[in-house]
């Protein structure tokens, strides 16, 4: 490892109404010369480590979470690893971890509250 990837998420929980869409913000600082082929991005449920969404080998691997999640592909190269969760349900409430690996890795958890 050359130096940990710093991953930033909001400190405060994201609050969403049932049925609306929520954005779980996550960002990292890409180094000069960074390309998406180097990126491994994994969103997981923090406690269970269940896979939610991933981007590896230069492409979006899609949602593993009831097909209700999406990344912002046009913003990934700038370090925006945020996740869109569609049609929020009460059962979605909890902590989501954004795991970013380039050459080294880092991770951070963001909480979702459903109102």
């Amino acid at each position: 490892p050359t130096g940990a990837v710093e991953v930033q998420v909001p400190e405060d929980p994201v609050v969403a109404l049932v049925g609306t869409d929520a954005t779980l913000r996550c960002s990292f600082s890409p180094e000069p010369g960074f390309s998406l082929a180097q990126l491994n991005l994994i969103w997981q449920l923090t406690d269970t480590k269940q896979l939610v969404h991933s981007f590896t080998e230069g492409r979006d691997q899609g949602s593993a979470y009831a097909n209700r999640t999406a990344l912002f592909p046009d913003l990934l190269a700038q370090g925006n690893a945020s996740l869109r969760l569609q049609r929020v349900r009460v059962a979605d409430e909890g902590s989501f971890t954004c795991f970013v690996s380039i050459r080294d890795f880092g991770s951070a958890a963001v909480s979702l509250q459903v109102a």
Partner: antibody, heavy 116, light 108 residues
Framework: QVQLQESGPGLVKPSGTLSLTCAVS?????????WNWVRQSPGKGLEWIGE???????NYSPSLKSRVTISIDKSKNQFSLKLNSVTAADTAVYYC?????????WGQGTLVTVSS | EIVLTQSPGTLSLSPGERATLSCRTS???????LAWYQQKPGQAPRLLIY???SRATGIPDRFSGSGSGTDFTLSISRLEPEDFAVYYC?????????FGQGTKVEIK
């Protein structure tokens, strides 16, 4: 380059408490990473014990949860393991390691023997 | 918890030969949620492969990983003297994270 180093007593009495510390060098323990304890015994192989995030949030292995406490000291750039009510079955090499998913890097490991 | 079963327990090969190590998971996992480690006597495990097929920093290209679902493979194309060691797989798709029991690659 982040390096990890475990320290603590190599011998603990049955029913006592195992206490180990992992010193992090070459980087800050406050970075966005999880810090783990893993042990290795001849009987059970490699076994994840638990993890801590710089915020203090912890997750523990269900099989050890009732006996384990992991804490972090950001001012000393270190984190610690306490395992109470130990028995001979807790004799193992204990490693600290970094990572939420895979583990990298690892400390060199320290052998802890539970014996009277 | 997910149980990982590695086979064979021991693999006896000569330098220059190809090694194929198997790891089976008790539940299907996404391929990006599996890692491989190498451990030599008296040393800590060393990360080789993550995401089933991505080599960690500094790992030679003779090491490769593949697989999906419940069946995963670590291949070493041409064994070098320093490759004789114990290899472990690990899953991180379910908590607690768990390891296989290891495959020892020994000199024939």
């Amino acid at each position: 380059q982040v390096q990890l180093q475990e320290s603590g007593p190599g011998l603990v009495k049955p029913s006592g408490t195992l206490s180990l510390t992992c010193a992090v060098s070459g980087g800050s323990i406050s970075t966005s990473n999880y810090w783990n304890w893993v042990r290795q015994s001849p009987g059970k192989g490699l076994e994840w014990i638990g993890e801590i995030y710089p915020t203090g949030n912890t997750n523990y292995s269900p099989s050890l949860k009732s006996r384990v406490t992991i804490s972090i000291d950001k001012s000393k750039n270190q984190f610690s393991l306490k395992l109470n009510s130990v028995t001979a079955a807790d004799t193992a090499v204990y490693y600290c390691a970094r990572g939420y998913n895979w583990f990298d890097p690892w400390g060199q490991g320290t052998l802890v023997t539970v014996s009277s | 918890e997910i149980v990982l079963t590695q086979s064979p327990g021991t693999l006896s090969l000569s330098p220059g030969e190809r090694a194929t190590l198997s790891c089976r998971t008790s539940q299907s996992i996404n391929a990006i949620l599996l890692a491989w480690y190498q451990q030599k006597p008296g040393q800590a495990p060393r990360l080789l492969i993550y995401g089933a097929s991505s080599r960690a920093t500094g790992i030679p290209d003779r090491f490769s990983g593949s697989g999906s679902g419940t069946d995963f493979t670590l291949s070493i194309s041409r064994l070098e003297p320093e490759d004789f060691a114990v290899y472990y797989c690990q899953q991180y798709g379910s908590s607690p994270r768990t390891f296989g029991q290891g495959t020892k690659v020994e000199i024939k």
